[in-house]
Interface confidence: medium
């Protein structure tokens, strides 16, 4: 025997109080799949959260963070304060990276500079709190008329969130 509720599409719920008629989700609620007996309350993006996508009858609202903050957790469940490049976030706020470490992003932790000598290369540009060391070519790699070394752009995956 087929469940009559299975005919109710997304955006509706199966109303037991009305002979299992499909009723539209009330305002500020949604159902993303068919056959649901209740609609879920829409997420509200308040305070440090801002609305990235409005709630509809078939999908929940999506939040991101106000400027100066970034998302943490699945579906941006938390907002965390940004820091400046060259810093990492601590309980007492943003703290400069310790000597020998750097952070080229507004989030995340400080991490160690490249050790050029391990690769047998000279230091072309010293590291800072916000930038990694840039290594030059190995001495044997230098040939007359060789073009100057361009510091590489910081490696970063586009749009990659901490999840």
């Amino acid at each position: 025997l087929q469940d009559p509720c299975s005919n109710c599409p997304a955006g509706t719920f199966c109303d037991n109080n009305r002979n299992q008629i499909c009723s539209p989700c009330p305002p500020n609620s949604f159902s993303s799949a068919g056959g649901q007996r209740t609609c879920d309350i829409c997420r509200q993006c308040k305070g440090v959260f801002r609305t990235r996508k409005e709630c509809s009858s078939t999908s929940n609202a999506e939040c991101d963070c106000t400027p100066g903050f970034h998302c943490l957790g699945a579906g941006c469940s938390m907002c965390e304060q940004d820091c400046k490049q060259g810093q990492e976030l601590t309980k007492k706020g943003c703290k400069d990276c310790c000597f020998g470490t750097f952070n080229d992003q507004k989030r995340g932790i400080c991490r160690p500079w490249t050790n050029c000598s391990l690769a047998g290369k000279p230091v072309l540009m010293n590291g800072t709190k916000a930038r990694d060391v840039v290594c030059g070519p190995r001495p044997a790699d230098l040939s007359p008329g060789a073009s100057s070394v361009t510091p590489p752009a910081p490696a970063r995956e586009p749009g990659h969130s901490p999840q």
Partner: antibody
Framework: QSVEESGGRLVTPGTPLTLTCTVS????????VTWVRQPPGKGLEWIGV?????ATAFATWAKGRFTMSKNSTTVALKVTSPTTEDTATYFC??????????????WGQGTLVTVSS | DIVMTQTPSSVSAAVGGTVTINCQAS??????LSWYQQKLGQPPKLLIY???TLESGVPSRFKGSGSGTEYTLTISDLESDDAATYYC??????????????FGGGTGVVVK
């Protein structure tokens, strides 16, 4: 996406041993890789981490006892002069991404190293 | 280096019950704390990072809290599948403490 350890075997004390972590489905350009070990019946011990730029950091007890290096798809952990206390399962793990290298969300199954004379 | 002291070393509770595991750092680690679950013969599995952020796919029965030097993992509505050893792990960076990561000693959870 996966990481897989290899190279674990029975070695005699003092014989250098290199373990390899082979990654697939992602690029080491964007991730840090951590090595963790677990002696039989004991807890987890953090050994060290290698970052996207090749820089490494080691636990104080591990400095001088291990070295780490990498290429495009593998990370190598060398146990320079193993002792019986280095008998353990060795895990490699990928950080969530390079900025968030404080935690690891992709782990290998581990490779067993036994140091015995 | 900092030291992470995890208590208790083992705990037993009934299905449906609640278990609390504590982790104390020897200095302020600014919520850079993760919790892992490890079952026998398996690698660790990330549950929580940044002290309280639930990893994707982990049930909300697992809850992390704390700040400064004191952190807690609470497992509510215990299921038999939760029987495992749980570890905390911290990151630290400072001119005195140095730079690195460290695990707590682990807590074995038995579900009756």
């Amino acid at each position: 996406q996966s990481v897989e350890e290899s190279g674990g075997r029975l070695v005699t004390p003092g014989t250098p041993l290199t373990l390899t972590c082979t990654v697939s489905g992602f690029s080491l350009t964007y991730y840090a890789v951590t090595w963790v070990r677990q002696p039989p019946g004991k807890g987890l011990e953090w050994i060290g981490v290698i970052y996207d730029n090749g820089a490494t950091a080691f636990a104080t007890w591990a400095k001088g006892r291990f070295t780490m290096s990498k290429n495009s798809t593998t990370v190598a952990l060398k146990v320079t002069s193993p002792t019986t206390e280095d008998t353990a399962t060795y895990f490699c793990a990928r950080s969530a991404n390079n900025a968030w290298s404080t935690y690891s969300n992709l782990w290998g199954q581990g490779t067993l190293v036994t140091v015995s004379s | 280096d900092i030291v992470m002291t995890q208590t208790p070393s083992s705990v037993s509770a009934a299905v449906g019950g609640t278990v609390t595991i504590n982790c104390q750092a020897s200095e302020d680690i600014s919520s850079y704390l993760s919790w892992y679950q490890q079952k026998l013969g398996q690698p660790p599995k990330l549950l929580i990072y940044k002290a309280s952020t639930l990893e994707s796919g982990v049930p909300s029965r697992f809850k992390g809290s704390g700040s400064g030097t004191e952190y807690t993992l609470t497992i509510s509505d215990l299921e038999s599948d939760d029987a495992a050893t749980y570890y905390c792990q911290s990151y630290y960076s400072g001119s005195i403490s140095g730079y690195g990561f460290v695990f707590g000693g682990g807590t074995g959870v038995v579900v009756k």
